[in-house]
């Protein structure tokens, strides 16, 4: 459903981002070519592959909003 | 100094209903993902339920899903936790907790009994 | 759900000696952005549990440096160098790296 692809989505937002934009990068400064289209196909199957695989991730870890927060609360400022 | 006051706990039989508050001062709320633990008397703990700083993630336990729901004011600084169909087995102190375990309130017992 | 034992279920220990419990997962508490998210806890009778350490061996803060805590993967150890008065009451470990949180059953330290 949508919803869980946009649950999904945001689960993965952390650590797919720079890898996206590496990949991006990459295959934009490579001319069209035989080769370019190969590395766009395995970028696209890649993905779809991962989000099988994170999506069974995102069931068996904790998502990231439920974990220990970077800053203390205690060094936090008074309500 | 950070405080978490939980209120809302009593006796109520199988079946029944309590909802459970968490008053939150000393600290920015709104920043903070929160939990409520449970403790048995003289037993170990067990997590309840989990829910993020705006209150659109959520988790539960599985064997509270369908019955608990959590949920946030940040604009009143208060967690909430809305216990429905009650089972001896719920019986407990629930404690309010900061994601991460660092600050707990004192707790408030919930007893559910005929 | 993993689960966490820990051993001993209860010790006696002289003021001045050192304690060790240990903790023991039924999978690596390793969680995917590498951090491994183990915690120890301290419940003193009649009060509600505090954090000692997070992230395995990291103290908070105003915890004596006598508490360390230590492992990696799925086995973890709390040693307490030094016990004092204190120190008594029930020592818990927990995880939060997946998505159903446990704890351990507790282990009670006695000060002789």
């Known amino acids: 459903s949508e919803a869980e692809d946009a649950s999904l989505l945001s689960f993965m937002q952390g650590y797919m981002k720079h890898a996206t934009k590496t990949a991006k990068d990459a295959l934009s400064s490579v001319q069209e070519s035989q080769v370019a289209q190969q590395a766009r196909g395995w970028v696209t199957d890649g993905f779809s592959s991962l989000k099988d695989y994170w999506s069974t991730v995102k069931d068996k870890f904790s998502e990231f909003w439920d974990l220990d927060p970077e800053v203390r609360p205690t060094s936090a400022v008074a309500a | 100094q950070l405080q978490l006051v939980e209120s809302g706990g009593g006796l109520v039989q199988p079946g029944g209903s309590l909802r459970l508050s968490c008053a939150a001062s000393?600290?920015?709320?709104?920043?903070?993902?929160m939990r409520w633990v449970r403790q048995v008397p003289r037993k170990a703990l067990e997590w309840v339920s989990s829910i993020s700083t705006d209150g659109g993630g959520t988790a539960y336990r599985d064997s509270v899903k369908g019955r608990f729901t959590i949920s946030r004011d940040n604009a009143k600084n208060t967690l909430y936790l809305q216990m429905n169909n009650l089972k001896p087995e719920d019986t407990a102190i629930y404690y309010c907790?900061?994601?991460?375990?660092?600050?707990w309130g004192q707790g408030t017992q919930v007893t559910v009994s005929s | 759900d993993v689960v966490l034992t820990q051993t001993p279920g209860s010790l006696s220990v002289v003021p001045g000696e050192s304690a060790s419990i240990s903790c023991k997962a039924t999978q690596s508490l390793v969680h995917i952005d590498g951090k491994t998210y183990l915690y120890w806890l301290l419940q003193k009778p009649g009060q509600s549990p505090q954090r000692l350490i997070y992230q395995v061996s990291t103290r908070d803060s105003g915890v004596p440096d006598r508490f360390t805590g230590a492992g990696s993967g799925a086995e973890f150890t709390l040693k307490i160098s030094g016990v004092k008065a204190e120190d008594a009451g029930v020592y818990y470990c927990?995880?939060?790296?997946?998505?159903?949180?446990?704890f351990g059953q507790g282990t009670k330290l006695e000060i002789k």
């Open positions: 907790v900061i994601a991460g375990y660092s600050d």
């Open positions: 927990a995880q939060d790296t997946y998505s159903t949180k446990t």
């Open positions: 000393g600290f920015t709320f709104g920043t903070y993902s």
